[in-house]
């Protein structure tokens, strides 16, 4: 039926969106190790790359995020 087709299409669109994001995260992780070796771009003491820096920061900060399940940012209304 048309309803079933629409439901299947919606499911597939959601699946593809999730798959794309998963792939982006996976590629990003691979990229991180490559960047760590190159160590170019931003510079600081104790971190091999900017990506390494952010990964460390957000992991350490996760305990505060876990205290607040509402992680969506709030912007000033654009309108």
């Amino acid at each position: 039926s048309e309803a079933e087709d629409a439901s299947l299409l919606s499911f597939m669109q959601g699946y593809m969106k999730h798959a794309t994001k998963t792939a982006k995260d996976a590629l990003s992780s691979v990229q991180e190790s490559q960047v760590a070796q190159q160590a170019r771009g931003w510079v600081t003491d104790g971190f091999s790359s900017l990506k390494d820096y952010w990964s460390t920061v957000k992991d350490k900060f996760s305990e505060f995020w876990d205290l607040d399940p509402e992680v969506r940012p709030t912007s000033a209304v654009a309108a």
């Epitope: 969106k17 931003w42 600081t44 992680v71 940012p73």
Partner: antibody, heavy 122, light 108 residues
């Protein structure tokens, strides 16, 4: 509600050091965001990241500015600051302090200060 | 050449749909974020992580990403949507955070 307010001189002479402070109200800089930073906007170069300081005090700098930039924080005053040394007219820009967020990469600026115009001129 | 490329200007008729693009090879592996900036004001986050919208942002703003292109779509553009729009992501090495050159949106 967290708010950011930049403060500092509007005019700086060439070769001097520019010092800016961002005062955060409505939440602690140690617990309300993973990191804070400075971004500047100049007519010729658009928006540029300058430096970032995390909730735990660790810092990161843009490569093009690393040699003359220092970011620091004062948790007792709930402030973080930027120092840019040996300024030239090319450093003339609107300087924004920012609150960073995001569990993915790269992070985004979830909140900006109002911005402060700094002119470098003799 | 900028790491993230945006069209300098775009015009849209009131009530119509505007699509602002941001192109860069790094967008294949890094998320894109979008900011709106009105004259004399600080930028405002209107979309993050490719397609997420901050609370407080009207539903007419939506982001999407496909391959090396990120797109901000404004469905039913309003007069108050006029301004500059910037995309932000990482460069191809992943080791620098960069902004696009900005797109000035005019609502006719």
């Amino acid at each position: 509600q967290v708010q950011l307010q930049e403060s500092g001189p509007g005019l700086v002479k060439p070769s001097q050091t520019l010092s800016l402070t961002c005062t955060v109200s409505g939440g602690s800089i140690s617990t309300t965001a993973p990191a804070w930073g400075w971004i500047r906007q100049s007519p010729g170069k658009g928006l540029d990241w300058m430096a970032v300081i995390a909730f735990d005090g660790s810092a990161y700098y843009s490569p093009s500015l690393k040699s003359r930039t220092l970011i620091s924080r004062d948790t007792s005053k709930n402030q973080f600051s930027l120092q840019l040394s040996s300024v030239t007219p090319e450093d003339t820009a609107v300087y924004y302090c920012a609150r960073l967020g995001g569990r993915n990469y790269p992070p985004y600026v979830e909140l900006w200060g109002q911005g402060t115009l700094v002119t470098v001129s003799s | 050449q900028p790491v993230l490329t945006q069209p300098p200007a775009l015009s849209v008729t009131l009530g119509q749909t505007a699509k602002i693009t941001c192109q860069g090879g790094s967008l294949r592996v890094s998320y894109a974020h979008w900011y709106q900036q009105k004259p004399g004001q600080a930028p405002v986050l209107v979309s993050y992580d490719d397609d997420s919208r901050p609370s407080g942002i009207p539903e007419r703003f939506s982001g999407s990403g496909s391959g090396a292109t990120a797109t901000l779509t404004i469905s039913g553009a309003q007069a108050e949507d006029e301004g500059d729009y910037y995309c932000q992501s990482a460069d191809s090495s992943g080791d620098n955070w960069v902004f696009g050159g900005g797109t000035h949106l005019t609502v006719l």
